[in-house]
Interface confidence: low
């Protein structure tokens, strides 16, 4: 049945009308408007942009648009006492200092309030000592250093290259290794694609470019001072010593020109293998300390940033549903940027703006969606997903009862090669069906569907003829909705060719060079990829809000549950002797997955056959679909991570950006051979299998016939 039957509207107000209203030229215009000055969270400029968006969304025709403010912990450099790193000689004289700012891009020389590169939430301090190069500072890199190479990082300043994992995990790993400071740098191997010029002549990172970013380990807590509750006017705030997720050692980021000066003098151990070498003309020696001639020189960090409780502002727009106003489909993306935000976030915010305008146009012509659509412009995402998390904490009771889906809308592009989608398995079929109806913007795929170009360029590793869809991890504003509240979530953007471009993220990520011109000149001059992303995000929202039966297929969850159960069983089977000794069995989990598969199959059959003209039965079936994601939530959360409550998916404990399946079992098994008390460790594995099996079985039962 077509979507428009729900609200008795004229046939022209269907998905096609919504999609046809989306215009690349408007997205381009909005991007320009949003990127002319910095919009750092907590600043007046970002408050003014919030008010502008509020005003424009009202003009576009939304029913209401409100600002929701919170007072959260943010972090800023000291304007009169800049952060930097020195090489000091034996007399303590500074013989080299890193740069205090990035050279501004052409045309932006006179822009004020460009925050210099810093690691948000770094404590103050001036540690000095020998340097140890720790590669990407991943868990496995520290294993290599400590276990294989017998190098002790205790009391050392470590230097790590950006990439592969979230920077907060790097800092946590360094802390656990005993380091007293961390220097983060962008290596050309990861942030300089071969054959491309540096900005402003291309999209590569120049030597003076630096990646900003927060270094928190919040594990979904939101504002560090008010975990679990909104940072409102009457909030009780923790003391800074009890704040969640703050680093305990000074951290600072630098570019590769400055990194060269630090790394070229490194002595000590040679790199263990080629995977530890980047592209600078340095030996990539691990250290500790400098080589012969320079062995008396040390590195000193000077960090003076401050943590401050600051007001932030979300913009929340509402388009009331005509039939089920108490069912919410949410489209949200952040507004705050580190500097100009040319890609992150404004390429996403511009797309949201155009989606709102298109929905508003339809509404002005008399149309309404079946369900309520909420639009959000989040603040302080860059400081730890704070705006979205505080709003969700404030509205958690409404969201857990009424939330149908959340679609994220950060950066629309990180490349211009093909589509990239991460979502709940419930949305696989929605994404497949939608992309089959959209035109591919890719060269060589004229007249072909987006599904076809996406599948060709990014094939599924498991299913031939289908595109890759990844697990949701974190590092963006869907986190609280999916990982904490269990609301079906998804995200889509255009991405690079991961096969040929092995650098991490895009080269100019979080640098001053992420400008409007970067996008307009190098990534998407015609804004055709932005338009495609608008069609995907907007099309998903349209279908989720307007289809009579929710476009969720529970059978796809059954398929992945089997895959994840096999995967975690295989990991456990690396320890066959211990599994025997401690009587570890996965039978309960496989049995629960089998039951889920059978019940999901029967539910899907009933979904085809029931009387859709009966509003009570329709609502009942839709509620079973809506609440399925919720059924995977464990109210007790994961061990030591109470705000990660989804039993099937959580951000990896080793990389916040990546999703891990059956994370409770995975973490219990991780490095289990090194645990001092194997009996206790394997007992925890068994407990986690029990929790997972129970949760899958309980979720299955929500799909059974109700009586």
């Amino acid at each position: 049945k077509s979507s428009n039957e729900a609200t008795n509207i004229t046939p022209k107000h269907n998905m096609k009308a919504f999609l046809d209203e989306l215009k690349a030229e408007n997205i381009k215009k909005f991007l320009y408007n949003f990127t002319q000055i910095p919009h750092l969270a907590g600043t007046e400029q970002n408050f003014q942009l919030a008010k502008q968006i509020q005003s424009q969304w009202k003009e576009f025709g939304l029913d209401s648009v409100e600002l929701a403010h919170y007072d959260v912990l943010l972090s800023y450099p000291n304007k009169t006492h800049p952060n930097y790193i020195s090489i000091i000689n034996e007399d303590g004289n500074e013989i080299f200092n890193t740069s205090l700012f990035e050279p501004p891009p052409p045309g932006y020389e006179n822009v004020s309030d460009i925050v210099p590169p810093f690691s948000a939430f770094s404590p103050q301090g001036m540690p000095e000592g020998d340097l140890v190069y720790v590669n990407y500072a991943r868990t496995e890199d520290f294993f290599k250093l400590e276990r294989d190479m017998k190098i002790n990082c205790s009391g050392k300043i470590v230097i790590a290259r950006y990439g592969k994992v979230f920077r907060g995990n790097k800092v946590k790993n360094a802390q656990l290794a005993g380091a007293k400071g961390v220097i983060l740098y962008s290596d050309p191997a990861d942030y300089f694609a071969p054959g491309v010029k540096s900005y402003p002549d291309g999209w590569n990172l120049p030597g003076g470019g630096v990646q900003r970013g927060n270094i928190l380990n919040l594990n979904g807590a939101g504002d560090p001072l008010t975990p679990g509750y909104p940072a409102n006017e009457y909030a009780y705030r923790r003391g800074i010593a009890e704040a969640v997720g703050l680093p305990s050692i000074p951290v600072h980021p630098i570019g590769y020109y400055d990194a060269q000066k630090l790394l070229e003098k490194m002595g000590g151990s040679a790199p263990p293998d080629s995977s530890w070498r980047g592209s600078l003309k340095v030996p990539y020696n691990v250290g500790p300390g400098f080589t012969g001639n320079f062995s008396t020189q040390k590195v000193k960090m000077h960090i003076h940033s401050t943590n401050e409780v600051t007001r932030i502002y979300n913009v929340i727009g509402t388009l009331r549903g005509a039939v089920e106003p108490d069912r919410y489909v949410i489209l949200g993306g952040h507004r705050d940027s580190w500097v100009f935000g040319g890609i992150d976030p404004q390429s996403g915010a511009a797309v949201v703006h155009e989606i709102v305008r298109s929905f508003g146009t339809l509404k002005k012509e008399g149309w309404r969606p079946r369900r309520t659509i909420l639009f959000a412009s989040w603040d302080a995402e860059e400081f730890g997903l704070l705006g979205s998390t505080e709003w969700a904490e404030e509205n958690s009771r409404l969201l857990q009862e009424r939330g149908v889906a959340y679609i994220n809308a950060d950066s629309s592009i990180e490349g211009n090669y093909t589509l990239r989608v991460d979502c709940t398995p419930l949305m696989y079929s929605l994404v497949h069906n939608l992309t089959k109806e959209l035109k591919s913007p890719d060269e060589g795929f004229e007249g072909k569907s987006l599904y076809e170009s996406w599948t060709k360029k990014s094939p599924s590793p498991e299913f031939s003829g289908m595109p890759r869809i990844s697990k949701l991890g974190s590092g963006n504003d869907f986190e609280v909705f999916f990982q904490r509240l269990g609301i079906a979530s998804g995200r889509a953007r255009y991405t690079k060719n991961w096969e040929t471009n092995k650098f991490s993220g895009y080269p100019l990520y979080h640098s001053v060079y992420e400008t409007y011109e970067l996008v307009e000149k190098f990534y998407d001059p015609m804004f055709k990829y932005h338009l495609t992303v608008a069609q995907v995000r907007g099309g998903m929202v349209f279908e989720l809000a307007n289809s009579i039966v929710l476009p969720f297929d529970c059978r796809d969850y059954a398929v992945v549950l089997r895959k994840y159960a096999d995967k975690i069983y295989s990991i456990s089977m690396k320890h066959p002797q211990e599994m025997k000794t401690y009587s570890v069995s996965f039978d309960s989990l496989f049995s629960a997955v089998k039951n889920f598969t059978e019940i999901a199959s029967k539910f899907s059959e009933r979904l085809q056959d029931f009387d859709k003209s009966n509003p009570i039965v329709l609502r009942m079936m839709n509620d079973q679909l809506m609440f399925l994601e919720r059924a995977f939530i464990d109210p007790l959360g994961l061990p030591d991570r109470p705000f990660y409550r989804h039993v099937i998916y959580a951000p990896s404990s080793h990389n916040k950006y990546a999703g891990e399946s059956f994370p409770g079992i995975y973490d219990a098994l991780f490095d289990i051979e090194s645990k001092v008390d194997p009996s206790k460790a394997w007992g925890e594995v068994k407990r986690q299998i029990y929790v997972a099996a129970f949760t899958v079985q309980a979720a299955a039962e929500t799909l059974s016939e109700v009586a």
């Epitope: 590793p461 498991e462 031939s464 096999d566 995967k567 295989s570 089977m573 690396k574």
Partner: nanobody, 124 residues
Framework: EVQLLESGGGVVQPGRSLRLSCAAS????????MHWVRQAPGKEREWVAV????????YYADSVKGRFTISRDNSKNTLYLQMNSLRAEDTAVYYC?????????????????RGQGTLVTVSS
């Protein structure tokens, strides 16, 4: 106990073919990806090919692409490697190896067990 037993090696002339087999026992063969790896005298071990648990996905090293074919028979718990157009540089001990996972993508390959190997010598 996991056991992998390779067979089918021998001396063969360049341009000719050979078919290696690997009989697996001690684990649920149909639930795991399987690999062939090889080691030439005095050289590092080289990954050759992987086949997913159900045979639906196969990946090959560039050096053997188009000449070698990996296959499996889950009913017989056996892995195969059909080697055509053999070259002198294919001379090596060939090992079959069990993946720790489903073996569905070359980026996620880690073998936890491998066999004793079978020697293939390509010489005129």
């Amino acid at each position: 106990e996991v056991q992998l037993l390779e067979s089918g090696g021998g001396v063969v002339q360049p341009g000719r073919s050979l078919r290696l087999s690997c009989a697996a026992s001690g684990f649920s063969f149909s639930g795991y990806g399987m690999h062939w790896v090889r080691q030439a005298p005095g050289k590092e071990r080289e990954w050759v090919a992987v086949i997913s648990y159900d045979g639906s996905n196969k990946y090959y090293a560039d050096s053997v692409k188009g000449r070698f074919t990996i296959s499996r028979d889950n009913s017989k718990n056996t892995l195969y490697l059909q080697m055509n157009s053999l070259r002198a540089e294919d001379t090596a001990v060939y090992y079959c190896a069990k993946d720790a996972n489903w073996g569905q993508h070359p980026d996620h390959t880690s073998f936890d067990y491998r066999g004793q190997g079978t020697l293939v010598t390509v010489s005129s």
